[in-house]
């Protein structure tokens, strides 16, 4: 008799999820000498324990604590780059500017980037058919709670000047409902963080507007100022040139505004 299985609105667990997590862990620990002590099999054990056999709408940050403990990592607190709705460019940037880090440049972020996962209550099975959608089903699902947990910890660790890359092509350049807007902004520590510097990335080639004057950016500035953190904002009019100049800062064309 086939077992009844909950049908969720979101896509199911990424195929070969355990193998992918394990393989990423092995790769990461090989590349990053400071994480060589990590036992990837134990990391997977902690990961599986966070969501398997649990109702996928009833996951808590507490469920992820064993994984957080195993994945504890020190990144330079003054070299943190947050991002919202512009992940690819943020990652391209930290691949060039190797001393800066996005969340996905840390072990835990790297393990889970672009993956989906969930289990089923009271069975030791992974659900490859469907997983809860944040909007249509529930917010306390394994993926959302994971990112909320690691994002909070990442923001809490930041110090000095924190940078955030924002997508100037979106109607809400700063979105209060994004992970950045709902988690990271509120977990920057005013006693450690002096300034949040926003980089607004322009999409159109001929777009010369000052997007730092956008109402949503003003809203971000207000939230940050109320938290006793200074705010600054820069327009990145030419993201392609911006990346090129990060690679080759001596290039003569890199003295002008990008």
């Amino acid at each position: 008799v086939p077992r009844w299985r909950q049908q969720w609105s979101g896509p199911g667990t990424t195929k070969r999820f355990p193998e992918t997590v394990l393989a990423r862990c092995v790769k990461y620990t090989e590349i990053h000498p400071e994480m060589r002590h990590v036992d990837c099999q134990s990391v997977w054990d902690a990961f599986k324990g966070a969501f398997i056999s649990k109702h996928p709408c009833n996951i808590t940050e507490e469920d992820y604590q064993p994984l957080m403990k195993l994945g504890t990592q020190t990144v330079p607190c003054n070299k943190i780059l947050l991002w919202s709705r512009i992940k690819d460019l943020a990652h391209q940037f930290t691949q060039v500017q190797r001393d800066m880090f996005t969340l996905e440049d840390t072990l835990l972020g790297y393990l889970a980037d672009d993956l989906t996962w969930c289990g089923e209550f009271n069975t030791s099975k992974i659900n490859y058919q469907s997983c809860p959608d944040w909007r249509k089903d529930c917010s306390n699902n394994p993926v959302s709670v994971f990112w909320k947990t690691v994002s909070r910890r990442f923001a809490e660790a930041a110090c000095d000047v924190v940078h955030v890359m924002l997508n100037g092509s979106r109607s809400k350049i700063f979105d209060k409902n994004s992970t950045f807007g709902s988690v990271e902004v509120h977990n920057l520590q005013p006693e450690k963080v002096q300034t949040l510097e926003a980089w607004v990335i322009h999409g159109g080639r001929e777009d010369s507007r000052d997007l730092c004057q956008d109402p949503t950016i003003k809203e971000l500035e207000s939230i940050i100022s109320k938290r006793n953190i200074q705010f600054s904002c820069k327009n990145i009019y030419r993201p392609d040139k911006f990346l090129q100049c990060v690679k080759n800062p001596e290039d003569s064309s890199c003295t002008s505004e990008i």
Epitope: L22, A23, S42, W44, D45, K48
Partner: antibody, heavy 120, light 107 residues
Framework: QVQLVQSGAEVKKPGSSVKVSCKAS????????FSWVRQAPGQGLEWMGR????????NSAQKFQGRVTITADKSTSTAYMELSSLRSEDTAVYYC?????????????WGQGTLVTVSS | DIQMTQSPSSLSASVGDRVTITCRAS??????LAWYQQKPEKAPKSLIY???SLQSGVPSRFSGSGSGTDFTLTISSLQPEDFATYYC?????????FGQGTKVEIK
């Protein structure tokens, strides 16, 4: 039918090393992990370590770290356990056992066991 | 390391008896628990996984229950072939650890 066939009994001198093999057949070798579990005469079961052939990674119990090397050869579908600096307390039956890579289930198949006797 | 403690260490029972073996973990292991049966000079055989799921081909007189730290293996009606040693094992974290075993003998 899945089978794990282990190498034969060994008699070793204290201070020497032993390497036990476990050949898997009847399943996709790279889809599984292989653990080594030992049992001293009249005693219980003791987990030593585990290898994931697909990824080429292994871990082991702290008690054996520095003395045990667990490897796998995908081309021959064989897992190996090498134990060095043997002492009399290492006299035991050594079993290999299979579980899924994700470690969501038990050791579902076991080898027949290999008796290793350490004696001067 | 997680310690697994089984009780009793041995018991005598008759064919047809209901037998219960308990296993306690030194810390919570959710349902990551397996039970094995071992007969003399043989390799262990998997009976139960995920605390209560019956391994394929295992008779339904075997059942498991529990979660967290306290677990039970029950044989509802002991058969002659069930006289053996039973081990619990956690697979919540490394190192994997086994209980010390419970020997079920003929009364």
């Amino acid at each position: 039918q899945v089978q794990l066939v282990q190498s034969g009994a060994e008699v070793k001198k204290p201070g020497s090393s032993v390497k036990v093999s476990c050949k898997a057949s009847g399943g996709t070798f790279s889809s599984y992990a292989f653990s080594w579990v030992r049992q001293a005469p009249g005693q219980g079961l003791e987990w030593m370590g585990r290898v994931i052939p697909q990824l080429g990674i292994a871990n082991s119990a702290q008690k054996f770290q520095g003395r045990v090397t667990i490897t796998a050869d995908k081309s021959t579908s064989t897992a190996y356990m090498e134990l060095s600096s043997l002492r009399s307390e290492d006299t035991a039956v050594y079993y290999c056992a299979r579980d899924d890579i994700a470690a969501l289930g038990p050791f579902d198949y076991w080898g027949q066991g290999t008796l290793v006797t350490v004696s001067s | 390391d997680i310690q697994m403690t089984q009780s009793p260490s041995s018991l005598s029972a008759s064919v047809g008896d209901r037998v219960t073996i308990t296993c306690r973990a030194s810390q919570g292991i959710s349902s990551w628990l397996a039970w094995y049966q071992q007969k003399p000079e043989k390799a262990p055989k998997s009976l139960i996984y995920a605390a209560s799921s019956l391994q394929s081909g295992v008779p339904s007189r075997f059942s498991g229950s529990g979660s967290g730290t306290d677990f039970t293996l029950t044989i509802s009606s002991l058969q002659p072939e069930d006289f053996a040693t039973y081990y619990c094992q956690q697979y919540n974290s490394y190192p994997r650890t086994f209980g010390q075993g419970t020997k079920v003998e003929i009364k």
